[in-house]
Structures are given as C-alpha cells and as structure tokens.
Interface confidence: medium
C-alpha cells in the first residue's frame, strides 16, 4: 500500500472580494483513518479554518460529502471573501488517536484577493 499523499493541485487561487473561494484538496488513500483540517498559515500561529470532525465554520462548506467514509475529496468553499482572508491555506491529514496527531500536509494553496469589480 502506497503511503497517503495530500494533494493540493493549485499553487494559487485569485478571487474577487465578496466572491467564494474554492480550495481543492484530495487524499490518495483512506489509510490511516483520521480527520482532515484546513489551516491558514503554517507553524504554531496557524489559524484553523475548518475541522472535518468538529466545530462551527459558518463561511466554509465542503465541496463533496466529506462525512462519507469512502470520501477522498476534502475541497472546501469559503464564502464572502475579504482581503483579510488572503494567505496560504494548507489541507492537513490527521491520524485518529487521543489526541489526533498530524500525519501529512498538502503543499499549500495561496489565496489572493482582488478588489471587488466596480
């Protein structure tokens, strides 16, 4: 069995303010079991954007049915983008445990925000 890869196919996404941004992420294996989380930025100060397992993220929706056991697409859509949302977003696979532990991160997708068309 090949080791799971986290694929973020887009190095960058550019979105107009007020629109929704779709950030793509797929994994290549169902093993190991564990949730996906999305973060903005890297390191200790990174900001949690979405947690598949728990939490309330009103601006984030999943593109596919991420609750299904066999799902391998963890792309998200973030609504009503503002300039404050600019940054690099990482899709991160966790291994199930107590607590869950980080297993592998995608390469990142840089979100840039264009001015709202007048």
């Amino acid at each position: 069995e090949e080791e799971l890869q986290v694929i973020q196919p887009d190095k960058s996404v550019s979105v107009a303010a007020g629109e929704s941004a779709i950030l793509h992420c797929t994994v290549t294996s169902l093993i190991p079991v564990g949730p996906i989380q999305w973060f903005r930025g890297a390191g200790p100060a990174r900001e949690l954007i979405y947690n598949q397992k728990e939490g309330h993220f009103p601006r984030v929706t999943t593109v596919s049915e991420s609750t299904k056991r066999e799902n391998m697409d963890f792309s998200i859509s973030i609504s009503n983008i503002t300039p404050a949302d600019a940054g690099t977003y990482y899709c991160v696979k966790f291994r199930k445990g107590s607590p869950d532990t980080e297993f592998k991160s995608g390469a990142g997708t840089e979100l840039s925000v264009r001015a709202k068309p007048s």
Partner: antibody, heavy 118, light 108 residues
Amino acid sequence: DVQLVESGGGVVRPGESLRLSCAASGFTFSDHDMSWVRQGPGEGLEWVAGISLRGGVTWYADSVKGRFTISRDNSKNTLYLRLFSLRTEDTAIYYCARESWNTFFDYWGLGTLVTVSS
Amino acid sequence: EIVLTQSPGTLSLSPGETATLSCRASQNVRSNLAWYQQKPGQAPRLLIYDASSRATGIPDRFSGSGSGTDFTLTISSLQSEDFAVYYCQQYGNGPPLTFGGGTKVEIK
C-alpha cells in the same frame, strides 16, 4: 507580446552555486504562477520548481529539493532560481515558463544553459 | 509520481500523412494533460491543453483526445514545419509535474 528572457547560466564546477533570472514582460506578472523546467543535453523535459503568484507557495522536484530555491520579485517582474551544491547531472538548458490558469505552460523563454563540469 | 510513457519513440512519415502519437499515464489524470511541440534549438510550444483544447494560434490539423490514462495527439496532413519532438505533460495533481519522454516525428 509575452516575453520571458532567462539569464545567469554559465559553466561552474560541482558543488558551486548560480542564480538564474527570468525577466518577464508583456503580461501582468503577478497574475501568474511561474515555473522552471530544464532539459539535459539530448534529453526530455523535466519540471524543476514552481512558485505561486505572490510567492507564498513553492514546489520542487525531488531531484532538486533542498538544493534549489525558487523566488520572485513582482515589483521587478522577475523570477529567480538559486542553484546550490550543483552536480554534473544538473547540466541542462533551464527554461522559465509561465503557467496558465492551470499548471500547464503557455509561454516559455528561450532558456539559459547551465554546465556543471570539473 | 505519475509516469507518462510516450510511444512510439520515433515516427517516420512523409508530408501529407497522418501522425498518431500516444501518451499513457501510470495513474488516472482525468483530462489534465497537455501536449507541446519542440523544434531543435527552440523552446517548447503549447499545442493542446485539457487533453483536447487547442492553444491559441494552433492550426486545426492538431487534435488531442483521451482521458484517464490513455491520450492521443493526431496531426493530420503533416506539413514540413510539423517535423519535431512532441511531449505530453500531466498536471492537476500537484507536484511533481511530469512530462513524457517525447516522440520524434521525422521525415521518411
């Protein structure tokens, strides 16, 4: 007209370093992800490294990871590739390539030749 | 890493004939495949993207087809300027981006 002009190639010894530059004109440089692709003598094409439109995400081929660094200066419309710890197998023409909306290459420079020889 | 295998390595044809070039991927790449032409001493030029869409300024004698793992570039009625090396490239799965080994189309 879109133009990409590489410079900085030359003859170096194994273990030495170089910095390649790619001057871009004829398009909005900061709207495009960019890549370097190389071609060894008599060989095919090999993608080397890519960078997102603001520089927040960089990707590398395994063969150069840890030895090469891609960067960009959007104020100067210039893409860079720093080559460290050069090996004889790094001998190639290095092309700067503009990425279209997805990760294929719609414009290429004419290339700059790097020769690593003792 | 997705490996792209191009065949044949060399295709010997006469002007006016049709060239059929194959590119096979080791994994499903959906329609995320491009074709490039390279002439000696020149940079590659984009011909086809998304497996079947012609790039700007590319004549309609160049056509691409396929999806998943099997792709074909067809050059109908070969012109003298079409004799070159052709490369396929997969994209859309993140790094590393990979190219096929190339097919040389030469004059018979």
